[in-house]
């Protein structure tokens, strides 16, 4: 095979174009200049290279950049990104959100791969915190992202980023994660008026303390039962019957259907029967 290592006459690639799809792997290796490839990476995606040919192109870039690719190359990797290993990606320094978006787009519709997870971790660590634009981007591609972070990692999320969080992004969060996110949301939305504030804070209320629930009960918020059932039991227990009635508004009738479930069950057991009777729902303490 040694005689094939030199580029045949007239085959040296002056640019990255469609003609290269007819090159054998050894010809790509011998005839494509790595520096040229790096400057014309944006063209690679438009050319229907085979997986084997992409392997050769990756190898050329690896030789040119043994310490890791520069961001100018990373941003234009396109489908070549799918050939990268987590070990490759750990060598990168990705700082541009546009680069992150471009690579997440390549993986769109697929489950998060180890490569993507490594890329995201590198990007977030490089930024030092999960800023709003980053969180916006990550949750758009992966709605469950926030709930896979530990409470400690979530503590580095600035309150301003909470504006990027949608209710569905919190669907799989556990109570300890909500304990961390709720105070940030409260701070983020503090300047909104009553009804608008409640709409925004609602999905974070699984982390709310008793005093905040008491305050909400004074604002005619009409909390639905689904939200009430997600509240912390220890936060609900001290509420009076009158406060729960104000908090739920017309939804208070739903307590009957949930009387055997926490936190309703535990709350009922804490109330005086006379007070429960004022609701007219037949709740038995």
């Amino acid at each position: 095979e040694v005689e094939k290592t030199a580029c045949p006459s007239g085959k040296k690639a002056p640019e990255i174009d469609e003609s290269l799809i007819f090159y054998k792997k050894w010809e790509l290796e011998a005839c494509v200049d790595a520096a040229l490839l790096a400057t014309q990476m944006d063209r690679v995606n438009a050319i229907p290279f085979t997986y084997e040919q992409l392997d050769v192109l990756k190898h050329k870039l690896d030789e040119l950049y043994p310490q890791g690719y520069p961001e100018s190359v990373i941003q234009h990797l396109g489908y070549l990104f799918l050939k990268m290993s987590p070990e490759d990606i750990r060598k990168w320094n990705v700082t541009s959100l546009e680069t992150l978006k471009a690579l997440l787009e390549v993986n769109k519709g697929h489950e998060m791969s180890p490569q993507v997870a490594t890329l995201i971790d590198r990007f977030v660590k490089g930024r030092g915190q999960l800023d709003k634009d980053t969180l916006d981007t990550l949750t758009a591609f992966y709605p469950g992202y926030l709930c896979s972070l530990s409470p400690e990692e979530l503590s580095s999320v600035p309150p301003s980023s909470i504006w990027a969080v949608r209710p569905q992004d919190l669907d799989t969060c556990d109570p300890r994660q909500l304990d961390v996110l709720y105070p940030k949301a409260r701070l983020a939305f503090q300047n909104m008026n009553g009804s608008e504030y409640f709409v925004k804070i609602q999905s974070f209320l699984g982390g709310a303390p008793t005093e905040d629930l008491k305050a909400l009960s004074q604002q005619n918020v009409s909390m639905d039962l689904a939200t009430f059932m997600k509240l912390r039991t220890d936060a609900v227990l001290p509420l009076t019957v009158a406060e729960v009635q104000k908090l739920l508004g017309p939804h208070v009738e739903g307590l009957k259907a949930e009387e055997r479930h926490r936190p309703v069950r535990d709350w009922i057991l804490r109330q005086r029967q006379d007070d429960l009777d004022t609701l007219g729902l037949g709740l038995q303490g």
Partner: nanobody
Framework: QLQLVESGGGLVQPGGSHRLSCAVS????????MRWYRQAPGKEREWLTS???????AYADSVKDRFTISLDNAKNMLYLQMNSLKPEDTAVYYC?????????WGQGTQVTVAS
Amino acid sequence: QLQLVESGGGLVQPGGSHRLSCAVSVSTFTRYAMRWYRQAPGKEREWLTSIYSDGSSAYADSVKDRFTISLDNAKNMLYLQMNSLKPEDTAVYYCNANVDSKAYWGQGTQVTVAS
């Protein structure tokens, strides 16, 4: 597609100890929150504990000093060590994984605490 399979359920004496296991079908995930939940008859599912990819863990107050969550990455196994068991711990126990931003559930394993 990731799959979770719990095992180790059974009958335990009050005051006794027991360990549940959850086999995780893949090991290539990078970012995760692994959790244990339980559901007693006629009650809603209750979160018990979580372990996260940074190695930290969290517990519900009801089990804080009695239950311990652990993950053996080499064996792809999640565990729940339960001590000082009480009759009110009787439930179906489920493992849950929020892995690389998707949520998965096991089928559950029954634990009955009775003498």
